[in-house]
């Protein structure tokens, strides 16, 4: 997956720090006070549609096979720059029952971006 | 995650059958002869951005928090209808060395769609 460097406008991963205080979530998240969430942005021209980071998922490869051959409805489907690999992170927080929990929360950090 | 029923144009899962013969992959895939791959299509208006099927992923919730409040650059980020839950499927196929392999292949079937 590409890292955004300001030189290309093709689908890439952009660094982004989230402060829980800034978004008002510090009333339920005890630690950390923030984290590098990152996000995906950039163009997905047809020739890179279906490229999920460094590897292709079977499904996106199949759909792209139809898309590249102009098959309806896939020819009109927008290919999007989305997270293709997310990483968990450990958090200390108040859960639904207002108990303090330390847990690995899934899908917190974007590791890789790709074209859907 | 919504199933497409032809009545709504909001992000949903559309049934789609892939025939390996049709796409010319029957020379290396022994079984099955095809499968219901499905795909995602539909609009992602701002109020449903960040909704991954029935539950929210932490990352998409955080990004949507910024997007809903018009923060740059998230206000301009396209929210996309993409697979949020994929399922593996067992396949019998020839590998590079022409050995017959039976294996669960990840990310074959779209189970749920959501807005990134």
């Amino acid at each position: 997956g590409l890292e955004c460097d300001g030189k290309v406008n093709i689908c890439c991963k952009k660094q982004f720090f989230v402060s829980f205080k800034d978004i008002g979530w510090n009333d339920w998240i005890i630690a950390p006070s923030g984290y590098h969430a990152n996000y995906c942005e950039g163009e997905c021209p047809s020739h890179i549609a279906g490229t999920s980071g460094s590897s292709l998922s079977f499904h996106s490869t199949v759909i792209n096979h139809y898309r590249m051959r102009g098959h309806s409805p896939f020819a009109n489907l927008k290919s999007c720059c989305v997270p293709t690999k997310l990483r968990p992170m450990s958090m200390l927080y108040y859960d639904d029952g207002q108990n303090i929990i330390k847990k690995d929360i899934q899908n917190m950090i974007v590791e890789e971006c790709g074209c859907s | 995650g919504l199933e497409c029923d032809g009545k709504v144009n909001i992000c949903c899962k559309k049934q789609f059958f892939v025939s390996f013969k049709d796409i010319g992959w029957n020379d290396w895939i022994i079984a099955p002869s095809g499968y219901h791959a499905n795909y995602c299509e539909g609009e992602c208006p701002s109020h449903i951005a960040g909704t991954s099927g029935s539950s929210l992923s932490f990352h998409s919730t955080v990004i949507n928090h910024y997007r809903m409040r018009g923060h740059s650059p998230f206000a301009n980020l396209k929210s996309c209808c993409v697979p949020t839950k994929l399922r593996p499927m067992s396949m019998l196929y020839y590998d590079d060395g022409q050995n017959i392999i039976k294996k669960d292949i990840q990310n074959m079937i779209v189970e749920e769609c959501g807005c990134s």
Epitope: I23 | T51, S55
Partner: antibody, heavy 122, light 112 residues
């Protein structure tokens, strides 16, 4: 300390509408689900619907579909439940309840409002 | 919709004695993530409901340890090891696995 403060009791005529408010204080508003639950006199609890505040997505029980509208205003940390075409059977105490963070519809409800009695009578 | 059935309807108890309430769902509340989406609430006379047990067996903050929840799938139990006078009220089970969220009919616990 989190508090959910609901609007006062209402007396309504059949066929009219009622809008009940639920103001949250003592915590952030956005990462939660607000559900509305009603209780007719001497009866049990009945879920009407709710709203996921992060996305503004509302969900209604089939029984109330078309008659209930649940909204939220983040600037005032207030959720609203409007019920239209009122009938005598809608006489009940209406509660708002706040689900845990990022639990969506699969939330547990630790915080509850004090309840709002709505009486429908001609 | 998932139907929640509670028993008994009424439960007269003696302070200091144990008590048990059953809740059965019309379909399994066990999610693939391993959680049972079943909560127990107590509504004391003239008050709003309060959360006792969430996700089948977790005690909510501030709830005395005489309360415990058990069960999985379709059969759940709320136990009070030693009933106290302040425990009177109506106990409800609630499923949150899928919408619409549904409650049991309630069990009224009163002192003998």
């Amino acid at each position: 300390q989190v508090q959910l403060v609901q609007s006062g009791a209402e007396v309504k005529k059949p066929g009219s509408s009622v809008k009940v408010s639920c103001k949250a204080s003592g915590g952030s508003f956005s990462p939660y689900t607000i559900s509305w639950v009603r209780q007719a006199p001497g009866q049990g609890l009945e879920w009407m619907g709710g709203i996921i505040l992060t996305s503004g997505t509302a969900n209604y029980a089939q029984k109330f579909q078309g008659r209930v509208t649940i909204t939220a205003d983040e600037s005032t940390s207030t959720a609203y439940m409007e019920l239209s075409s009122l009938r005598s059977e809608d006489t009940a105490v209406y509660y708002c309840a706040r689900g845990g963070p990022l639990s969506g519809w699969r939330a547990s409800y630790y915080y509850w409002g004090q309840g709002t009695l709505v009486t429908v009578s001609s | 919709d998932i139907v929640m059935t509670q028993s008994p309807l009424s439960l007269p108890v003696t302070p200091g004695e144990p008590a048990s309430i059953s809740c059965r769902s019309s379909q399994s509340l066990l999610h693939s993530n391993g959680y049972n989406y079943l909560d127990w609430y107590l509504q004391k006379p003239g008050q709003s409901p309060q959360l006792l047990i969430y996700l089948g067996s977790n005690r909510a903050s501030g709830v005395p340890d005489r309360f415990s929840g058990s069960g999985s799938g379709t059969d759940f139990t709320l136990k009070i090891s030693r009933v106290e006078a302040e425990d009177v009220g109506v106990y409800y089970c609630m499923q949150a696995l899928q919408t619409p969220i549904t409650f049991g009919g309630g069990t009224k616990v009163e002192i003998k």
